[in-house]
Each structure stands twice: as structure tokens, then as C-alpha cells.
Interface confidence: medium
């Protein structure tokens, strides 16, 4: 038994990365800890060193192979253990039977670009990164646009319920600076969550009339 409350959460990016966060109230300080991944039916195992991200939480990334290699499938179950050094021994602090395709969090979309911009609308495209071919078209997206004088949290969410890697933003204000972000989520997986938001794409709508100063 471990003193304090422990939480061990991991997500699979659908290709070759499992990211984990371990939180432990009253956890031992200055102790070396790692996450060990042991698949149920594969010839490899992997470890990563847990590094502190706050007073009582640590994180690490299990790199399973080349970024676009399909290292796990829907059938795999990976036993994940948090091991902390106790003298000359390793002590198991947390354990979970990890089903990768039930715990998905994809990489943030990349390569955002303005395809076409007008006074009141802007067409933007993006690409998904390191997403498994298993999903086929079973992905959804959320997008948000940052308007002047507002925060990201205030921005309304636009939902795309299909694999659509573009959006046409309407009813924009002419000659105005905006920022745009998008995130992706597979439809599969009981504990699947949204990817991080993409890097913001800044764009400016065209002026309303020719000759107007920008």
C-alpha cells in the first residue's frame, strides 16, 4: 500500500507514444521513478523516466518506435506500472491494465493554413498528425476562433462531426485580426479525450472596400 492518494493516467496517441501522468499526495521526494510498459502479446517492453511537472505530479512519454509506426492495435493490452526506487529495489507504486484504443488522445492537428480569405469569411485547412489508419474516417474535430478583445475560453466551439480537415469561417468582421485553433478526437474509446489544441493560426480578413488602409 502507498500512503496518500495516487492517480495514474495514460493516453495513447494511436501510433507509437503513450503519455502518462502520475499524481501522488505525500509522494516521496527526490526518488527516482519510472513507468514500465509490458504488452500482453508483443516482444518489446519500454520504460520512461518520470519527471516532475508540479509539486505532486510527474509525467513521461513512452516512445514505442518511429512516430508513424503502428506499435499497438485495438486488441493490445499493456500493463503499465509506476516503479520507484527504494534502496536497491524497485517498488510498484501503481499499476493499470491499459487498453490503448480505449484511452486515446491524438497529437494536435498541424499544418494549419489559410486557403482563402475574404472580408467576411476565411477557409482554413489542417492535417492530423500520427493518427492511426484504423480510424479510417471515424474522427471528429472542434475548432475555435479568437476575436479581438476576447479570450480563448470565451470563444464558441464549432463542432465538425466527421473527418473534415477544413472549415469555412463565416460572419467575420472585415480587416480584423483573428486566431484559429482546432483539435481532434477519435470516436472510438471509452476514456478517449480531445487532443491538445493546435498551435494558433493568425489571419486577417480583407478590408471591406478597395483602397482602405490596413
Amino acid at each position: 500500500a502507498v500512503n496518500g492518494t495516487s492517480q495514474f493516467t495514460c493516453f495513447y496517441n494511436s501510433r507509437a507514444n503513450i503519455s502518462c501522468v502520475w499524481s501522488q499526495d505525500g509522494a516521496l521526494q527526490d526518488t527516482s521513478c519510472q513507468v514500465h510498459a509490458w504488452p500482453d502479446r508483443r516482444r518489446w517492453n519500454q520504460t520512461c523516466e518520470l519527471l516532475p511537472v508540479s509539486q505532486a505530479s510527474w509525467a513521461c512519454n513512452l516512445i514505442l518506435g518511429a512516430p508513424d509506426s503502428q506499435k499497438l492495435t485495438t486488441v493490445d493490452i499493456v500493463t503499465l506500472r509506476v516503479l520507484c526506487r527504494e534502496g536497491v529495489r524497485w517498488r510498484v507504486m501503481a499499476i493499470q491494465d491499459f487498453k490503448p484504443f480505449e484511452n486515446l488522445r491524438l497529437m494536435a492537428p498541424i499544418s494549419l493554413q489559410v486557403v482563402h480569405v475574404e472580408t467576411h469569411r476565411c477557409n482554413i485547412s489542417w492535417e492530423i498528425s500520427q493518427a492511426s489508419h484504423y480510424f479510417e474516417r471515424h474522427l471528429e474535430f472542434e475548432a475555435r476562433t479568437l476575436s479581438p478583445g476576447h479570450t480563448w475560453e470565451e470563444a464558441p466551439l464549432l463542432t465538425l462531426k466527421q473527418k473534415q480537415e477544413w472549415i469555412c469561417l463565416e460572419t467575420l468582421t472585415p480587416d480584423t485580426q483573428y486566431e484559429f485553433q482546432v483539435r481532434v478526437k477519435p470516436l472510438q474509446g471509452e476514456f478517449t479525450t480531445w487532443s491538445p489544441w493546435s498551435q494558433p493560426l493568425a489571419f486577417r480578413t480583407k478590408p471591406a472596400a478597395l483602397g482602405k488602409d490596413t
Partner: antibody
């Protein structure tokens, strides 16, 4: 040496219950997933479910709700609890473990235990 | 569930013959296994991941295939090979087996 030994089979009436045991030796049940597979007389093999090293379970929908897989870590033993038994549950029941890091598939099998459901 | 269909369901061959069994999956599978089951015994793993020979298995046994179509071959049938052979997929749950192919000696 990895060994699996099933026990607990026998004759049971329809609607009855039975608990099968699978005693493991040569490895720890907290380090490997163990599966239950059955074979009706003169028929093929049917996967029933598994208990993984962390203790979570997975079932074939055909038996989910009636069959429960559990384990006792201190005894290094797995169990298959079977409720609401039917004539079609008559079979030899095997526990099996996948291989180690050198190869996959069900490399280790018990000898099986016969369950007969009949009035 | 993925259905695994083996053919033939039974065959009779002479010692030294080349024996081939096919396994057809109802949808594409990534990992295929072959087992041998002698009468009254538990199954024995012969082939893992489609084509790899399990530990201690004679080299006369082999496997091949991909997608939905797989083949198991005994290059030179021996008397001790009398058994029923099963294919099994481990690409999605529930894990499923073929119905078996009974191999006899003429």
C-alpha cells in the same frame, strides 16, 4: 517451468453453478494475463475471457453476465465462476497463458477439466 | 465477431505427403496462430504471428498468409501428426478459432 492445473469440474444440473480453479506455477499471475477457453464434446475451441496482470477482465459476450473470472494472488490461482449453467455449457474447460517475450499465442495450457451440465 | 473458416474440415493423406490447410477470416486479421490438438489432449501452439515456429516445433510445420487468407502446411506428414489443427485470430476480441481440420493417415 510454467504449469497450469485446472480443477473443479463435474456434473451439475441446469441452472446450477460451478467454480473452476486454475492453479498456476512457474510464474506469477500478477505478471501475465490468463485466459479461459472451452471445448464442447467433438467441437472446436471457444475463447471465454481473460484476466490481465493488473486484474481487469475481458469476456466473450456469449458468456458475459453468467461467467466471472477472478484470481487469488496469494494462492497464484485463477477462477472461473459459472452461473445459470445450461446444457450447451457442457465442455472441457482450459486455462491458458500466452508466451513470454519470445513468442505470442497460447503457449501454455492446462490439461482441462470436464464440466457436464445435465439433469 | 470475426469468423474463422477452415478448409477442409478433414483430410486423409499418406506419410510423407505435403498437407495444406487454409483458414479464411471474415475480415482482415493481423495476428494468426495455428494449434495442434491430439485426441484427449490440450491444444499445442505450433505457429505464432502467421509464420513463426513456436519453441520446440519441428520445421516441417509452416504458416503463411495475410489479410483474410492464411495457409498452414505440413511439408512431410508423419504418423505423430495425426491430430486436429485449429487456426486462431488475435486481432480483435472475442478471440476466435476456426472449426478445426482433422488430419488422418491413409
Amino acid at each position: 517451468e510454467v504449469q497450469l492445473l485446472e480443477s473443479g469440474g463435474g456434473l451439475v444440473q441446469p441452472g446450477g453453478s460451478l467454480r473452476l480453479s486454475c492453479a498456476a506455477s512457474g510464474f506469477s499471475v500478477t505478471s501475465y494475463g490468463v485466459h479461459w477457453i472451452r471445448q464442447a464434446p467433438g467441437k472446436g475451441l471457444e475463447w471465454l475471457g481473460a484476466i490481465w496482470s493488473g486484474g481487469s477482465t475481458q469476456y466473450n459476450a456469449a458468456v458475459k453476465g453468467r461467467f466471472t473470472i477472478s484470481r487469488d494472488n496469494s494462492k497464484n490461482t485463477l477462477y472461473l465462476q459459472m452461473n445459470s449453467l445450461r446444457a450447451e455449457d457442457t465442455a472441457v474447460y482450459y486455462c491458458a497463458r500466452a508466451g513470454d517475450a519470445n513468442y505470442d499465442g497460447f503457449a501454455y495450457w492446462g490439461q482441462g477439466t470436464l464440466v457436464t451440465v445435465s439433469s | 465477431d470475426i469468423q474463422m473458416t477452415q478448409s477442409p474440415s478433414s483430410l486423409s493423406a499418406s506419410v510423407g505427403d505435403r498437407v495444406t490447410i487454409t483458414c479464411q477470416a471474415s475480415q482482415s486479421v493481423s495476428f494468426l496462430y495455428w494449434y495442434q490438438q491430439r485426441p484427449g489432449k490440450a491444444p499445442r501452439l505450433l505457429i505464432y504471428d502467421t509464420s513463426n515456429l513456436a519453441s520446440g516445433v519441428p520445421s516441417r510445420f509452416s504458416g503463411s498468409g495475410s489479410g483474410t487468407s492464411y495457409t498452414f502446411t505440413i511439408s512431410s506428414l508423419q504418423p505423430e501428426d495425426i491430430a486436429t489443427y485449429y487456426c486462431q485470430q488475435w486481432s480483435t476480441y472475442p478471440l476466435t478459432f476456426g472449426q478445426g481440420t482433422k488430419v488422418e493417415i491413409k
